[in-house]
């Protein structure tokens, strides 16, 4: 999906109002320097591409993020403010239902959400720098 035509201001507002709090709640208790910064993004569409990938693409050591509250809200936000996004996700959702796993917060998942915080931060800040 090409995130170029999204309403970035509306996505920012949704992130600051709800998604950020769910991410923080998920990370609560972790140490600041537990996880290295390994993922970055350079502009708003690129940030959203990376955010979508980390949030919704299961990895061998972290399969369950898509069912977390912050992921559900991220999906709703992208569907609302990115034209045609929800249509592109129908097939992906069907595939995800087939490989649903028991929900476990692993260290690898915490590391992934730590990267998400960094990506969202860049998304918001890139937006501010453009204004």
């Amino acid at each position: 999906y090409d995130f170029t035509n999204c309403d970035f201001q509306k996505i920012e507002a949704d992130y600051l109002r709800t998604i950020s709090k769910d991410l923080i709640t998920y990370m609560s208790g972790t140490k600041s320097t537990d996880f290295n910064n390994t993922v970055s993004c350079s502009n708003r569409p690129h940030c959203l591409t990376e955010i979508q990938s980390l949030t919704f693409n299961p990895t061998p050591r972290c399969a369950s993020l898509a069912k977390e509250m912050f992921a559900r809200k991220t999906k709703a936000t992208l569907a609302l403010w990115c034209p045609g996004y929800s249509e592109t996700q129908i097939n992906a959702t069907q595939a995800m239902k087939k490989r649903r796993k028991r929900k476990v917060t692993t260290n690898k998942c915490l590391e992934q959400v730590s990267q998400l915080l960094g990506l969202w931060r860049r998304f918001i800040r890139t937006l501010l720098k453009k204004q």
Epitope: I24, M27, T30, K31, N37, S40, S114, R122, I124
Partner: antibody
């Protein structure tokens, strides 16, 4: 162990610029964010900005935007904070501090006193 | 920016006393609050993060609590080395802000 060692005290005239350094050791320099926080006499701590050494991405507190520039020298594992157009209110102790993506500060430099006086 | 308001600004107490410092955020910061101790001429030292987690090496007499907009730092039994200035900080928003500080003095 992680160590952040800052440059020495500076005295500057109003309108001038100052550049403070922070040499990092004891960890992989590109792994964490480097922040700058200042404290004017009797005032609260004030976050100025940060840099991600892995790609030199910077982010600044809007109160300082346009006056502060944070850079890194990868080969020397050193971060720099330059503040321009100095005024007397910029007299403060300037600290570098380290975080991951979660931004509370578990490692600090020893501080650098910058005095702005005519 | 989110404002962090500490109270009291000054606090006089004696060794062995139990003291509580309060920090109020101008909007919901969930539990993204840290507490620092600072002594004259020194850098701040992290005491508490995530509102209630003690940093490595911090004595058990220091505890933190709270969520949303109201947070407290409690020292259960003051020791001579605890007389210092204490700051809260929120890291929920993207511009990190600190309280104005609470100076804890010997009565």
């Amino acid at each position: 162990q992680v160590q952040l060692v800052q440059s020495g005290a500076e005295v500057k005239k109003p309108g001038a610029s100052v550049k403070v350094s922070c040499k990092a050791s004891g960890y992989t320099f590109t792994s964490y964010l480097m922040h700058w926080v200042r404290q004017a006499p009797g005032q609260r701590l004030e976050w100025m900005g940060e840099i991600d050494p892995s790609d030199s991405y910077t982010d600044y507190n809007q109160n300082f935007r346009g006056r502060v520039t944070i850079t890194v020298d990868m080969s020397a594992s050193t971060a720099y904070m330059e503040l321009s157009s100095l005024r007397s209110e910029d007299t403060a102790v300037y600290y570098c501090a380290l975080t991951g993506t979660i931004n509370y500060f578990d490692y600090w430099g020893q501080g650098t006193l910058v005095t702005v006086s005519s | 920016d989110i404002q962090m308001t500490q109270s009291p600004s000054f606090l006089s107490a004696s060794v062995g006393d139990r003291v509580t410092i309060t920090c109020k955020a101008s909007q919901d910061v969930v539990t993204a609050v840290a507490w620092y101790q600072q002594k004259p001429g020194k850098a701040p030292k992290l005491l508490i993060y995530w509102a209630s987690m003690r940093h490595t090496g911090v004595p058990s007499r220091f505890s933190g609590s709270g969520s949303g907009t109201e947070f407290t730092l409690t020292i259960s039994s003051l020791q001579p080395e605890d007389f210092a200035t204490y700051y809260c900080q929120q890291y929920s928003s993207f511009t990190f802000t600190f309280g104005q500080g609470t100076k804890l003095e010997i009565k």
